[in-house]
Amino acid sequence: SEVEYRAEVGQNAYLPCFYTPAAPGNLVPVCWGKGACPVFECGNVVLRTDERDVNYWTSRYWLNGDFRKGDVSLTIENVTLADSGIYCCRIQIPGIMNDEKFNLKLVIKPAKVTPAPTRQRDFTAAFPRMLTTRGHGPAETQTLGSLPDINLTQISTLANELRDSRLANDLRDSGATIRIG
């Protein structure tokens, strides 16, 4: 049986999944798929990690936690009704039939008030949210030096999120300029 999680249209959905690495750095592959966990692997894979990195992801799907510490919780950005359904988190522990499988049912509710598209979504469309996967995407996705200057008077709604987000760290580390005012 699956456990039910809820989100509203336009929000980010959070699907928790964890494991305890046998030792620091002793990671196991993890896959996330749309649909219940099959006998092996994940069907319709939306994100995958290996022993070192996030090696596959699709747009809007990211890990906000630190998967190197065993936090492999999935965030789905800006959900729509079409995102409803069962998701599989599979911890691919070595050995025959050792995998840990979690079937999570995501229920999307219509937004109470349909929000106008925010500037923040404009921004994330231009710079995909994989930038906030806590720096654990493949190396080439972390080359942020080419980001343009960002004028936060034009993207004021982004300011609060930047304050406590990985993106702020990534932007700071990349040397991109954030102008306020």
């Epitope: 456990v3 039910e4 999680y5 959070y14 928790p16 964890f18 305890t20 620091p24 750095g25 936690g65 630190d66 190197r68 510490k69 065993g70 936090d71 979690f102 999570l104 806590r134 720096g135 406590d164 990985r166 760290n169």
Partner: antibody, heavy 117, light 107 residues
Framework: EVQLQQSGAELVKPGASVKLSCTAS????????MHWVKQRTEQGLEWIGR????????KYAPKFQGKATITADTSSNTASLQLSSLTSEDTAVYYC??????????WGQGTPLTVSS | DIQMNQSPSSLSASLGDTITITCHAS??????LSWYQQKPGNIPKLLIY???KMHTGVPSRFSGSGSGTGFTLNISSLQPEDIATYYC?????????FGGGTKLEIK
């Protein structure tokens, strides 16, 4: 052997700030989330917040936003908790704990903090 | 925030008894629940994680069960050293939260 050694008891005046420390041995703090938990006398456990020492990212309980600041120094393998604008309500034992990743498998011995004039 | 409602708040039982402590989450936390024992004057110690997995060195008379929103901690054949306060904790999402605790006394 995994150990979390916390700094000693503190007696401070209202309005002051204090910084408590938690030094780890037997593991590298950058490999784990490090948390702080408050316990007032004869009361329950309250989660204050946590840090990812690998990059300094923090999370706080809303109640402790602005009151608590958690930092980590990976070179000394130490996590710290700073509490500001102290009042008698902050008198408590403060524990550091390691999570793995969603439960606390090791705890420090606790640091008693007394706020009194 | 996810509220963790733990009951009873106190419990008196006889040696050899089996006791049950319950914890109810205000929203689903799947199996991301742990149980801790805190003896008087001591630090909390992990008993159970992932709702039912026993931590290393914990006596087999302790067991946990449940998923979703309802969880139980069972202690069978109660021993004098089990006098303590027991807490549940959800580690699914921030802010982390604890139950209010159950103080166990021996009759």
């Amino acid at each position: 052997e995994v150990q979390l050694q916390q700094s000693g008891a503190e007696l401070v005046k209202p309005g002051a700030s204090v910084k408590l420390s938690c030094t780890a041995s037997g593991f590298n703090i950058k490999d784990y989330y490090m948390h702080w938990v408050k316990q007032r006398t004869e009361q329950g456990l309250e989660w204050i917040g946590r840090i990812d020492p690998e990059d300094g990212e923090t999370k706080y309980a809303p109640k402790f936003q602005g009151k608590a600041t958690i930092t980590a120094d990976t070179s000394s393998n130490t996590a710290s908790l700073q509490l500001s604008s102290l009042t008698s309500e902050d008198t408590a034992v403060y524990y550091c704990a390691r999570s793995n990743p969603y439960f606390f498998d090791y705890w420090g011995q606790g640091t008693p903090l007394t706020v009194s004039s | 925030d996810i509220q963790m409602n733990q009951s009873p708040s106190s419990l008196s039982a006889s040696l050899g008894d089996t006791i049950t402590i319950t914890c109810h989450a205000s929203q689903t936390i799947n199996v991301w629940l742990s149980w801790y024992q805190q003896k008087p004057g001591n630090i909390p110690k992990l008993l159970i994680y992932k709702a039912s997995k026993m931590h290393t060195g914990v006596p087999s008379r302790f067991s946990g069960s449940g998923s979703g929103t309802g969880f139980t901690l069972n202690i069978s054949s109660l021993q004098p050293e089990d006098i303590a306060t027991y807490y549940c904790h959800q580690g699914q999402s921030y802010p982390y939260t604890f139950g209010g605790g159950t103080k166990l006394e021996i009759k």
